[in-house]
């Protein structure tokens, strides 16, 4: 087969670069090395072109640089002679999104590269369980996200749509609360928040365990296991055990996988097993009293997941106590 060396060219060379809010990024541009190099990085919006960074006659020229880029851009000056015209861009803001054009001129070549910069943010979301009077709610919350995420709920692995969404931040980043009323339900719930730009997904899973009926002075074992489907082996996570009382949560124990440190806030609380395999975070609560009745919440959280397990404990008076009265 004869392959012709005849080409039709697309105008410019275009690349999409994705950065994160507040972080640094490199906008790439390369050229065949040459002498007397001229480099101009420009930002183009619908109305205007702004000078981002210029280099010619052997040095950076920032006299005409737009103020929004002051102290935030630089070139790799010692690599220019090797054909590197990439721009180092500090502290990205959402306003930096858009089209950047890098023009490079040498004695033998002219090159125009186009870079489309997109900026995203995805602060780790949270799943919260709240009781308001006699109602129970699950809240999926992301404090700072851009662009708008896709939020989906499932009940017993079946997608559902009835949720109440609240959003603040008109242009972004957005703060989003998605609330689901789960009063009287024994189902398991899952909330997924997806940032399609950053290709990041977070999942919150809530499970209500069967009620536990115990006698005073007995002990109770509260199960909480890390599901391998959710957590990868090297992922840092934290485990928090807390008790819900009149809508207020008080922490009983706290564990950090990175340091493998546990802090107990209740002396009667202890791990069921040694945390050798770091997957079973079941707890023992000893010497139960009537006031220990209530809801116990295990929260296992990483950057990508939150697993909430709820136990309802009913402590009843023992026979002796009952006959004494």
């Amino acid at each position: 087969i004869f392959l012709s060396a005849f080409f039709t060219y697309v105008p410019m060379n275009e690349q999409i670069i994705i950065g994160r809010l507040g972080e640094d990024i490199i906008l790439p541009s390369s050229f065949e090395r040459g002498s007397e190099v001229v480099i101009h990085w420009k930002y183009q919006d619908s109305y205007n072109s702004y000078n981002v960074h210029s280099y010619y006659k052997g040095s950076g020229r920032l006299e005409s640089q737009d103020t929004r880029y002051a102290n935030r851009t630089s070139l790799f000056y010692n690599e220019i002679q090797n054909g590197n015209a990439s721009l180092f861009f500090r502290r990205l803001s959402l306003l930096d999104e858009g089209i950047y054009t890098c023009y490079v001129g040498t004695a033998i070549q002219a090159i125009t590269n186009k870079v489309v910069l997109k900026v995203g943010v995805f602060l780790t979301p949270m799943m919260k369980y709240e009781k308001r009077n006699t109602n129970s709610f699950l809240i999926c919350n992301v404090l700072s996200v851009y662009p708008r995420p896709i939020i989906t709920w499932k009940m017993d692995n079946t997608p559902i749509s009835e949720n109440n969404m609240q959003e603040t931040g008109s242009l972004g980043p957005f703060s989003i609360n998605s609330t689901l009323n789960i009063t009287g339900s024994n189902s398991s719930y899952e909330c997924t928040i997806e940032n399609s730009l950053l290709k990041q997904t977070w999942t919150g899973r809530w499970t209500m365990k069967d009620g536990l009926h115990k006698m005073q002075s007995e002990h109770v074992s509260l199960s909480c296991e890390l599901v391998n489907d959710y957590f990868s082996p090297n992922q840092d996570f934290k485990v928090t055990w807390s008790r819900m009382e009149s809508g207020i949560s008080s922490i009983l124990a706290y564990y950090l996988s990175s340091s493998q440190n546990t802090t107990f806030y209740e002396s009667r609380f202890s791990w069921n097993k040694e945390l050798k395999n770091q997957s079973d975070f079941s707890m023992n609560l000893t010497d139960l009293s009537l006031s220990d009745s209530g809801e116990y919440l295990c929260n296992i959280s990483s950057d990508e997941y939150t697993l909430l397990t709820i136990h309802t404990v009913h402590v009843e008076p023992s026979q002796e106590t009952a006959s004494d009265n």
Partner: antibody
Framework: QVQLQQSAAELARPGASVKMSCKAS????????MHWVKQRPGQGLEWIGY????????DYSQKFQGKSTLTTDKSSNTAYIQLTSLTSEDSAVYFC?????????WGQGTTLTVSS | DIVMTQSHKFMSTSVGDRVSITCKAS??????VAWYQQKPGQSPKLLLY???TRHTGVPDRFTGSGSGTDYTLTISSVQAEDLALYHC?????????FGGGTKLEIK
């Protein structure tokens, strides 16, 4: 020595398209950018755009975007300009010129006459 | 786009005279200016680039100067063969732009 040999004069009807060539010799074709410049009778020079044979892309002056298409054939060391939807405004001499930011060698020019 | 303005369309001079052709850019072009000579019926020829660097084979009677927005091509002692159209061009950034040209006539 460096030479840029351009195709013969063209006579075209309004609305038609034309393709002119520029054959390079005496240097490595892919090393240099090829520019195209327009000159109307008794007027100054207008930069149309460039094509980068080694990289495989081009850049155009806004005015000529859509009007002109630049291509190359590396096997024959030839650059081409195609002009579409011709009008009398396109009647001019078209030069190819080798260079980076300045144009050190020029073709002899191709005269395009658009007339009904 | 950067606009290059050559205020004199024509300049008249005598052989042996010193002549200066000017060119003004609409913004600072950082000495990235080239000058071309175009004789009747011919294609342009590069004389200078980076405002003052002579291209190979260009006689030293041609000199260039300037910075910022104002640039000058000077012919120290005009010869009869210098009768031509002179173009300035900014090679600072694309789209490259040319001045309207200055025609040098011999009296």
């Amino acid at each position: 020595q460096v030479q840029l040999q351009q195709s013969a004069a063209e006579l075209a009807r309004p609305g038609a398209s034309v393709k002119m060539s520029c054959k390079a010799s005496g240097y490595t074709f892919t090393t240099y950018t090829m520019h195209w410049v327009k000159q109307r009778p008794g007027q100054g020079l207008e930069w149309i755009g460039y094509i980068n044979p080694s990289r495989g892309y081009s850049d155009y002056s806004q005015k000529f975007q859509g009007k002109s298409t630049l291509t190359t054939d590396k096997s024959s060391n030839t650059a081409y300009i195609q002009l579409t939807s011709l009008t009398s405004e396109d009647s001019a001499v078209y030069f190819c010129a080798r260079g980076g930011y300045d144009f050190d060698y020029w073709g002899q020019g191709t005269t395009l006459t658009v007339s009904s | 786009d950067i606009v290059m303005t050559q205020s004199h369309k024509f300049m008249s001079t005598s052989v042996g005279d010193r002549v200066s052709i000017t060119c003004k850019a609409s913004q600072d072009v950082g000495t990235a200016v080239a000058w071309y000579q175009q004789k009747p019926g011919q294609s342009p020829k590069l004389l200078l680039y980076w405002a003052s660097t002579r291209h190979t084979g260009v006689p030293d009677r041609f000199t260039g100067s300037g910075s910022g927005t104002d640039y000058t091509l000077t012919i120290s002692s005009v010869q009869a063969e210098d009768l031509a159209l002179y173009h300035c061009q900014q090679h600072f950034i694309t789209p490259y732009t040319f001045g309207g040209g200055t025609k040098l006539e011999i009296k």
